[in-house]
């Protein structure tokens, strides 16, 4: 129940963590014109990593898209590409870990597919994920340096009598929307791994099969010499009546591909 | 047709108050910032306050701030300005106008005479 | 505060001459989000409200005649009148709309030669 349950709230986590990165890449408040010269300004200027908008005092808004690729900075490229792959990744890593679910059935899968699926899944969320923190964490940079340049060269003007205001951006809102996003998406692919290993599927535990000697009623049951060498899962040397039947979810110890990611 | 009808003016008495509106038809009022610009006999415009269309925003200029409040009623397609220990230098035709793109207004009321003497 | 000046306060012209109206600010009135100047300029004749004539600097308000045309940027800006009708012969005002407090010129008059 617990892998389930983990698998689940990492999709989940994930699923909100991917909607936030596409809301953050398509927002327009990547970078806000910074109010503190001019709290009362008439004119209010934002950026986005696809357009660049004006909201007037007035209510009037006006948008302006990059119709550009050569004329834009490397950076704002670096960053597109970045929360484009982190998108990329996250929906095929969506699109996969749907399939990986343990609450639903598809045909015949086997638990060792699930298992598989689930775990590049989660890879790809955390990269996911990475990109975003990436993308956003260069555009922050990009505009902490450009507005300690424009704050030293703030005022331009002849013999101070005409000032010419540069105007100067800060973190918009796209930012944390983004910062947030990524960290979401990295936690659920986090989960998607941790939950990965508790579906591995265990070595198969034959039923157990009854052998009737002259004197003596023997149960043998295959695989218990597993106690003493540590490998099998019945490391508590417990009796396996059942046959080797067992709960969805019971921990697994053994080691397996999946415990060295 | 767009129509600003300023109400409200008259004699008051230094440190006095009074009640301005502006009754607005023709447009969408909650779509629109409206202002209040004044105009002293034989001088110039003088801007008095703005207010958002939904409320959110209010601006003073600085000699009024304190004794001039902006507000508006939607509802009632209504601008206000209440003014409160008014002066002689607030004597002055009083205009309420909308406000449009460019910052600018692109409609005025034919105003509203506000004189402050004893 | 911007500091609007408008120069001349006055101007004697005669009906069918240009005119050029010059309007200084104290500070930049040019966005650099939109490479908008905001600037706008104000017709007032006796005894009414005044007309918005021109915004953005440049940009004529519909139904003004295309004898107004606005010009400039920065801090330098002008209102020119080709071929000037009796009509015209009133006050205009340019007004800061880039920063509050929105201010505005004192004004220049123009009246018949």
């Known amino acids: 129940m617990a892998v389930t349950a983990c698998q689940g709230l990492g999709f989940v986590v994930s699923l909100i963590g991917i909607a936030g990165i596409i809301a953050a890449t398509c927002m327009d408040q990547w970078s806000t014109q910074d109010l503190y010269n001019n709290p009362v300004t008439a004119v209010f200027n934002y950026q986005g990593l696809w357009r660049s908008c004006v909201r007037e005092s007035s209510g009037f808004t006006e948008c302006r898209g990059y119709f550009t690729l050569l004329g834009l900075p490397a950076m704002l490229q670096a960053v597109r590409a970045l929360m484009i792959v982190g998108i990329v990744l996250g929906a095929i890593g969506l699109l996969v870990s749907i399939f990986a679910l343990k609450c639903i059935r598809i045909g015949s899968m086997e638990d060792s597919a699930k298992a598989n699926m689930t775990l590049t899944s989660g890879i790809m969320f955390i990269v996911s994920g990475l990109c975003a923190i990436a993308g956003v964490s260069v555009f922050a940079n990009m505009l902490v340096t450009n507005f300690w340049m424009s704050t030293a060269n703030m005022y331009t003007g002849m013999g101070g009598m005409v000032q010419t205001v540069q105007t100067r951006y800060t973190f918009g809102a796209a930012l944390f929307v983004g910062w947030v996003a990524g960290g979401l998406t990295l936690i659920g692919g986090v989960m998607m791994c941790i939950a990965c290993r508790g579906l591995a599927p265990e070595e198969t535990n034959y039923k157990a099969v009854s052998y009737h000697a002259s004197g003596h009623s023997v149960a043998y049951k295959p695989g218990g010499f597993k106690a003493s060498t540590g490998f099998g899962s019945n490391t508590k040397n417990k009796k396996i009546y059942d046959g080797g039947a067992r709960t969805e979810d019971e921990v697994q110890s053994y080691p397996s591909k999946h415990d060295y990611v | 047709e767009v129509q600003l009808v300023e109400s409200g003016g008259g004699l008051v008495k230094p440190g006095g108050s009074r009640k301005l509106s502006c009754a607005a038809s023709g447009f969408t009022f909650s779509d629109y910032g409206m202002h209040w610009v004044r105009q002293a006999p034989e001088k110039g415009l003088e801007w008095v306050a703005y207010?958002?269309?939904?409320?959110?925003?209010?601006y003073y200029a600085d000699t009024m701030k304190g004794r001039f409040t902006i507000s508006r009623d939607n509802a009632k397609n209504t601008l206000f300005l209440q003014m409160t220990s008014l002066r002689s230098e607030d004597t002055a035709m009083y205009y309420c106008a909308r406000f449009v793109r460019g910052n600018s207004m692109d409609y005025w009321g034919q105003g509203t005479s506000v004189t402050v003497s004893s | 505060d911007i500091v609007m000046t408008q120069s001349p306060s006055s101007l004697t012209v005669t009906a069918g001459e240009k005119v050029t109206l010059s309007c200084k600010s104290s500070q930049s009135l040019l966005n650099s989000g939109n490479q908008k100047n905001y600037l706008t300029w104000y017709q007032q004749k006796p005894r009414q409200p005044p007309k918005l004539l021109i915004y953005w600097a440049s940009t004529r308000e519909s139904g003004v005649p295309d004898r107004f045309t606005g010009s400039g940027s920065g801090t330098d800006f002008t209102l020119t009148i080709s071929n000037v009708q009796a009509e015209d012969l009133t006050v205009y005002y340019c007004?800061?709309?880039?920063?509050?407090?929105?201010?505005f010129g004192a004004g220049t008059k123009l009246e018949l030669k």
């Open positions: 007004q800061n709309a880039y920063s509050y407090p929105l201010t």
């Open positions: 207010i958002s269309s939904g409320s959110s925003t209010i």
